[in-house]
Interface confidence: low
């Protein structure tokens, strides 16, 4: 596989809508991994440093961003749903992590967090106390 | 799966850091409802998936739409799917 075609994902977490929280007493976080090629990724949610599976739903397979292109880049989405009270607890920390396997070994593309960087391979959010 | 009390809604989400991407969440809809792909190549819509909150014994269907287009709006994100008009919950102007 020509390395010209290897594109790591950009990962972003989107915070729950206040409308959802007030309407359902539940909070859904959405994680988007976009712009990657090839399509070998694994996505996981981590809450307070532990991987979680309950309340998680991830696309069964990545989506071609440009379906007409043979070598289109891919995207993947995942949802994590928790109770409103759990989301509003400021001690709770949520992280979406994507492992990307575009090279010859399996590599975990986790980002160093000591400086602001625009392309993170893990994205995170904190519970909101002020809502 | 059988969704006990479907309560279909579309919510707009915001990124935890400055982000050009707008995300719309379509959730809590009945299993008979299908989510159509967008005819706009700049709007991406996932297939529906089931989420199971085991601790609350609660299951829900969901799909996500997103785009980097500046004029992308959740009210039109799922326009090719049959969604009731009262499904859309606008985002509050002031971010909390």
């Amino acid at each position: 596989e020509d390395l010209k075609k290897v594109f790591p994902p950009k990962v972003a977490v989107f915070e729950p809508s206040e409308a959802e929280i007030s309407h359902t007493q539940k909070a859904t976080l959405v994680c988007l991994a976009t712009g990657f090629y090839p399509d070998h990724v694994e996505l996981s949610w981590w809450v307070n440093g532990k991987e979680v599976h309950s309340g998680v739903s991830t696309d069964p397979q990545p989506l071609k961003e440009q379906p007409a292109l043979e070598d289109s880049r891919y995207s993947l989405s995942s949802r994590l749903r928790v109770s409103a009270t759990f989301w509003h607890n400021p001690r709770n920390h949520f992280r979406c992590q994507v492992q990307f396997y575009g090279l010859s070994e399996d590599d975990e593309w986790t980002e160093d967090r000591d400086k602001p960087i625009t392309q993170k391979i893990s994205a995170e959010a904190w519970g909101r106390a002020d809502c | 799966p059988y969704i006990q009390n479907p309560d279909p809604a579309v919510y707009q989400l915001r990124g935890s850091k400055s982000n050009d991407t707008s995300v719309c969440l379509f959730t809590d809809f009945d299993s008979v409802m299908n989510v159509s792909q967008s005819k706009d190549s700049d709007v991406h819509i996932t297939d529906k998936t089931v989420l199971d909150m085991r601790s609350m014994d609660f299951k829900s269907n969901g799909a996500v739409a997103w785009s980097n287009k500046s004029d992308f709006a959740c009210t039109s994100a799922f326009k090719d799917s049959v969604i009731p008009a009262d499904t859309f919950f606008p985002s509050p102007e002031s971010s909390c």
Partner: nanobody, 117 residues
Framework: EVQLVESGGGVVQPGGSLRLSCVAS????????YGWYRQAPGKEREKVAH???????DYADSAKGRFTISRDESKNTVYLQMNSLRPEDTALYYC???????????WGQGTLVTVSS
């Protein structure tokens, strides 16, 4: 950040040999791939050879049987041994590294190889 510095280029007669070196510095522990690329005047940059941290190699058709890519982990250096050089091998040769962290992709400044009689 990762810095790459190439050396070893020069003028050589057809049929001759050269060994190019690429020294990596900085966050080298994050690198999991190295490659050599070349760009001839008026042409697009093209792949010559790749090597992974597992020492798996991959060559362009034009390099197979003549060029060998290798690395010395203790010196953070990648080599390209070029034998049976031809005039069409004349180009600016670049070293490339892929890292586990953003911005992922690093290139050196290049070293010039001229094959001429």
């Amino acid at each position: 950040e990762v810095q790459l510095v190439e050396s070893g280029g020069g003028v050589v007669q057809p049929g001759g040999s050269l060994r190019l070196s690429c020294v990596a510095s900085g966050a080298v522990h994050k690198i999991n791939f190295y490659g050599w690329y070349r760009q001839a005047p008026g042409k697009e940059r093209e792949k010559v050879a790749h090597i992974s941290i597992g020492d798996q190699t991959d060559y362009a058709d034009s390099a197979k049987g003549r060029f060998t890519i290798s690395r010395d982990e203790s010196k953070n250096t990648v080599y390209l041994q070029m034998n049976s050089l031809r005039p069409e091998d004349t180009a600016l040769y670049y070293c490339r590294a892929l890292s586990r962290i953003w911005p992922y992709d690093y290139w050196g400044q290049g070293t010039l190889v001229t094959v001429s009689s």
